[in-house]
Amino acid sequence: MLFDSILSTVGLSKLVSVVSSPAAALSKSNVKTFCSKNILAILGFSSIIAVIALLAVGLTQNKALPENIKYGIVLDAGSSHTSLYIYKWPAEKENDTGVVHQVEECRVKGPGISKYVQKVNEIGIYLTDCMERAREVIPRSQHQETPVYLGATAGMRLLRMESEELADRVLDVVERSLSNYPFDFQGARIITGQEEGAYGWITINYLLGKFSQKTRWFSIVPYETNNQETFGALDLGGASTQITFVPQNQTTESPDNALQFRLYGKDYNVYTHSFLCYGKDQALWQKLAKDIQVASNEILRDPCFHPGYKKVVNVSDLYKTPCTKRFEMTLPFQQFEIQGIGNYQQCHQSVLELFNTSYCPYSQCAFNGIFLPPLQGDFGAFSAFYFVMNFLNLTSEKVSQEKVTEMMKKFCSQPWEEIKTSYAGVKEKYLSEYCFSGTYILSLLLQGYHFTADSWEHIHFIGKIQGSDAGWTLGYMLNLTNMIPAEQPLSTPLSHSTYVFLMVLFSLVLVIVAIIGLLIFHKPSYFWKDMV
């Protein structure tokens, strides 16, 4: 079908109809003259069209080959661990949207950098394996031009709240250690919660092709909606959580939560907020500190842990973090034991007490008096939102919120011994906390951010998009390397695949025209006999 329409556009269908038309009434010489003239005209016309098309497409595209590849490295120094990401992109296309992709992720062995405050001399060794991996992955000739960025998030924000001097010491040693590698080290810093939210939003929309003004023949990007409406971003870490999206109406209610971007020639008014202490790990510490206040003795019967689960917690560890300061009290014991009772409903109720919804100085709030405009559009939920829900097998678009709740009830009530057997390969420290984390995610999304059973279907749990992890790191690098232009860049009019297709097509047309010409004008007279 497509081939028929292509034939007709370049005039070959005419040739076919002329050659196959009845010519019994015509003399041999008349036919020959008639065919020769028409075929000559058609062949000449087709050749000229094909040559012009080849030149036009070739000149307007003007692609420089071979491609010069660039690399970039971003280290995400989170509260629970550090991950190193390596990105690559074609140098000639660095202002295009969607050309940067992740080639490697390396998870650094050990806790987050904030835990090295008392052993800073170990930071260099801690980072070695992943930095050496980067050395291997990136061609040696590119090392000196490859920028390296380290962004520290909520774990370091919390350390800085406790002691600016200690946070500076950690960052200083991190910078010294990273500067010893042959890359173009661009520094280590604590990014703000607002930056973390904004860069996460940029990352997912960049990867989903939401900033692209080009129309595609087909889409290979998952979750892609018909229009260019951006996705909201939901990020959950160990120590903070971020919500970022473009609200329906531009809001000036809370300027602290408003960001203005101009990306690829379009203006975006974005709402963002980072809730420090509401990452899954710090939320658990908060919940334990709150619950131990009302415990009658050093036994804490906890519905957020599986029945039969037991763990001893040091009170000093509990009150170590600034996140539990509001619940701190003098306890008559130095340790207490968590005893799991595995009840989702009770766990959910306990978690809800972390969200103060009684006070709101705005038209609408999330919790703790923080402004939140009405939710709008689809949301990508990534990082721990994805890791936890993926473990629980609840990331499918088909699973309703009611079904998720049912599954959580079932999961939390399973005995600890049973859980350990079912998930033998998972570290017990992580395994024991999935009931809490899953419950916390549901509570945060439903009661914290006011998603409903209906709007739940607009949440897409995303791990990777086209091979790149969803998270703030890609957006951070794109910004720092000036790869997101404010204006739509002047780019080649066609995608590379379309360009190649057209070049091949017009070349084939030329070849076909040439072959037909040769067949007609270099065949003996029996060729014409057969035609008549």
Epitope: D168, V173, E175, R176
Partner: antibody, heavy 121, light 107 residues
């Protein structure tokens, strides 16, 4: 007020090594970094590397990576800079200098008197 | 690495006159910039840090300004002891880098 006192001038053969010392008097290193900066005759200042004596953490300029080793002995408040595989271009005055702060505060507020190292066959 | 460029290489000024020295960074260094003075046969001496803060014991005639990539050291009224070589240095990122220096000489 801390003063940095460096070891005396050295004359070395090409291919050999030199080790320059820098002792803090009137105070200790503490957690301050010690940087090493060199200056070839009639030329500008060139940073070579740095160490935090308290932790023994050193970092170096790429140009000197593999050829320079900076160490420190906290007990004697002394820092050392060893440069190997010496060549004539390494003829310079070598200074140690104290960094005034930690993270991104590496202004050099106290300098040693300098050590002249001559590399000649 | 961040490249620091100083201009002019040599500045001829009469005593009592004002001297303006420039320093440019190849990328933004915020205000993480220091100025040093070096006299022949001596070690450098810190004059200005944080782009505009005078170090202890530095006379008020020395002032620094600028942020990002463009910086200026101004000596309001040159004294005989001010004739020396002046270096700028960024300390935002490793490696620490110095400008090539500006020699202030007597006109």
């Amino acid at each position: 007020q801390v003063q940095l006192v460096q070891s005396g001038a050295e004359v070395k053969k090409p291919g050999s090594s030199v080790k320059v010392s820098c002792k803090a008097s009137g105070g200790t290193f503490g957690s301050y970094g010690i940087s090493w900066v060199r200056q070839a005759p009639g030329q500008g200042l060139e940073w070579m590397g740095s160490i935090i004596p308290e932790f023994g953490i050193a970092n170096y300029a790429q140009k000197f990576q593999g050829r320079v080793t900076i160490t420190a002995d906290e007990s004697t408040s002394t820092a050392y800079m060893e440069l190997s595989s010496l060549r004539s271009e390494d003829t310079a005055v070598y200074y140690c200098a104290r960094e005034s702060g930690t993270y991104r505060d590496h202004r050099l507020d106290v300098w040693g008197q300098g050590t002249m190292v001559t590399v000649s066959s | 690495e961040i490249v620091m460029t100083q201009s002019p290489a040599t500045l001829s000024v009469s005593p009592g006159e004002r001297a303006t020295l420039s320093c440019r960074a190849s990328q933004s260094v915020g205000s993480n910039l220091a100025w040093y003075q070096q006299k022949p046969g001596q070690a450098p001496r810190l004059l200005i840090y944080g782009a505009s803060t005078r170090a202890t014991g530095i006379p008020a005639r020395f002032s620094g300004s600028g942020s990002g990539t463009e910086f200026t050291l101004t000596i309001s009224s040159l004294q005989s002891e001010d004739f020396a070589v002046y270096y700028c240095q960024q300390y935002l990122l490793w490696p620490l880098t110095f400008g090539g220096g500006t020699k202030v000489e007597i006109k």
